[in-house]
């Protein structure tokens, strides 16, 4: 009642290995690492067979089949390439995930290499079975920002793609009678979030109450260069409008806000986010040079009061920009305290501009980012937001532009962008 001698399967083994197998003896067939037992189209780790009374085995010896991890999952804002010939997806094959450069980069700077494991899953040394995350690259425009000193007041045009984070925010408040329409700027922080000044998104009321405009009345344009031609721009409606809870209309303290877009915008050469600074109370140091862009008043012959009185919000057709030095807090405070009117430059603000005037931001530039190049990270960082200016005309002598100090609000911004109230859980790199 002996059963015939067994031959182990290719890439497999039989246990126990005996010279003779008698009635009721059992053997366990298993495969080498990276292979699985294949029996009747079923895949299993081991297979047991028994020597029967009539000297036959209860089953034929199964085969060992190489583990196949299958087609790798697609990566949002990324792609997968095969390192192994013939695009193999079997055990020990390698694939590499990469992000759509230069607009996205891999979180945690992982290699992106995944190997087909013995368990049939694509595995990375660091992330294990989790897929990598492609995050937007911030503060690195596809065109290098030039060193020329240009100005918004009487300035020349910015070129398309120089300020890919620049957003035009148009508010058409149809709840007002008659309807009220104005605009400002903002800066893209991620595919779904715009940073701007609170006063841009405050309902233009006849009293000083701070009430945000309804989200239905906000339209955001990205990748825009010339306001007369919006065909190439991405326009998006708002899912949420968030003003800083402590925004004070009397002194413009905490003049910062967020808009969550209805749907994420595709990034590209003309639409890229700006980086946020590290949370530090100092803000940018005096004399540091920053750039700010906007579609605000660029005609030095038109006075702000004329524009306010006429009711028109005159703007530049083509995006303008200016390079301005940061002014010391003490100098700025002193310049405003010497003026009539209740001007307070708080610790949540900083100033920029030239003592002699001539270069400045102006009405309509509100909410735009004052960006400074960070030598350490080699990124442009939004250190300020265009907030307010003195009673004189834009670009007047010893009247500095005042900017919201973004570094004081970084924690608040992350909190809001990652709060459960946010319409979707969108990841943004800190």
């Amino acid at each position: 009642n002996e059963c015939p001698k067994l031959q182990p399967p290719v890439y497999g083994k039989i246990e126990p290995s005996q010279a003779v197998y008698s009635f009721k003896d059992q053997v366990l067939v298993s495969c080498d690492t990276g292979y699985k037992v294949l029996k009747d189209n079923g895949v299993m780790d081991t297979f047991q067979i028994e020597c029967l009374k009539d000297g036959a085995w209860s089953n034929k010896i199964p085969t060992c089949k190489i583990v196949d991890c299958g087609a790798p999952a697609g990566l949002k804002h990324g792609l997968v390439t095969f390192s192994t010939r013939n695009n193999l997806t079997t055990y020990k094959s390698e694939i590499r995930y990469s992000c759509q450069q230069p607009y996205y980069k891999m979180l945690h700077n992982t290699t992106g290499v995944y190997t087909c494991s013995a368990h049939g899953t694509w595995t990375n040394e660091v992330l294990k079975r989790s897929l990598p995350t492609c995050l937007p690259v911030c503060g690195q425009p596809s065109r290098a920002l030039p060193n020329l000193v240009k100005r918004i007041i009487g300035g020349r045009n910015a070129e398309l793609g120089l300020f890919p984070w620049q957003a035009l925010i148009v508010v058409e408040d149809t709840s007002r009678v008659p309807n009220d329409k104005w605009f400002g700027s903002g800066a893209l922080l991620s595919e779904s979030w715009i940073l701007t000044a609170a006063h841009v998104l405050r309902s233009q009321r006849r009293d000083n109450t701070v009430i945000p405009v309804s989200k239905e009345h906000v339209t955001v344009y990205l990748g825009l260069h010339d306001v007369r031609d919006k065909s190439g721009a991405v326009n998006s409606s708002a899912a949420r409008v968030i003003l800083h809870p402590d925004f004070n209309i009397q002194n413009y303290n905490h003049d910062i806000a967020l808009v969550q877009l209805q749907k994420p915008v595709p990034l590209g050469a003309h639409v890229m986010p700006i980086c946020l600074p590290r949370p530090e109370p100092e803000g940018p140091a005096p004399h540091m040079l920053g750039l700010v862009a906007g579609w605000g008043i660029s005609n030095p012959n038109v006075t702000v009061d004329e524009i306010i009185l006429s009711g028109t919000r005159t703007l530049s057709d083509v995006l303008q920009y200016v390079k301005l030095p940061v002014v010391s807090h003490a100098e700025c405070k002193a310049s405003y305290e010497s003026r009539s009117g209740n001007y307070s430059v708080t610790e949540n603000m900083f100033c920029a501009g030239y003592y002699e005037g001539g270069k400045d931001t102006c009405l309509g530039d509100s909410g735009g980012a004052f960006v400074i190049f960070d030598e350490m990270s080699q990124h442009w960082v939004a250190q300020g937001l265009v907030s307010w200016g003195g009673p004189e005309e834009c670009g007047s002598k010893q009247v500095y532009g005042v900017y919201t100090k973004v570094s004081n609000y970084v924690d608040w911004l992350w909190e809001e962008m990652n709060s459960p109230r946010a319409v979707r859980d969108l990841q943004v790199e800190r």
Epitope: S175, V177, R206, I249, Q250, Y343
Partner: antibody, heavy 114, light 112 residues
Amino acid sequence: QVQLKQSGPELVKPGASVKLSCKASGYTFTSNDINWVKQRPGQGLEWIGWIYPRDGTTKYNEEFTDKATLTVDVSSSTAFMELHSLTSEDSAVYFCSSVEDSYWGQGTLVTVSS
Amino acid sequence: DIVMTQSPSSLAVSAGEKVTMSCKSSQSLLISRTRKNYLSWYQQKPGQSPKLLIYWASTRESGVPDRFTGSGSGTDFTLTISSVQAEDLAVYYCKQSYNLYTFGGGTKLEIK
């Protein structure tokens, strides 16, 4: 067109309460606050408070914080003002206004008398 | 609290005359940042609800005749009616909206 229609005149006894209504139509009710103003016979205007229908935020003139309670019913686009512990001093015409005072109700006369 | 004082308390003019009335506030109503004075003017005709004439000290409400003009800044404001008509018989109130709301005592305009 925009209209604010206020409830009819009220004759109430001292110590009692009364609830006045102001029904809005013809504009975005939730996006515009409703103000309430008091005018005693032959006297000037006194601001009582306002309510913002979108989130129910209220602001009151300090002199009316214990006297008036403002509420809204968004489904019917109606604002309400309840006046408590009435005395003869509360006998007045009460107006509601909206869209930042561009539109006013016709007023409700409240008479407090025993 | 901001106190609003109107003067005169009443005045009588003939039709066609120019009239000015004053409103003073106990503190400045100008918000430098917005370059706006938070002051409004209202007209209340006998037996009627008040009507908004001017807001932000000088912006005329739509539909208001251009004979009504608001001016002033800070704490001193004026409402001018360039050529008074018979239908302008009313009490005129100013109101601050710089910090909540406060009405002035009113100026009663009578036609001679």
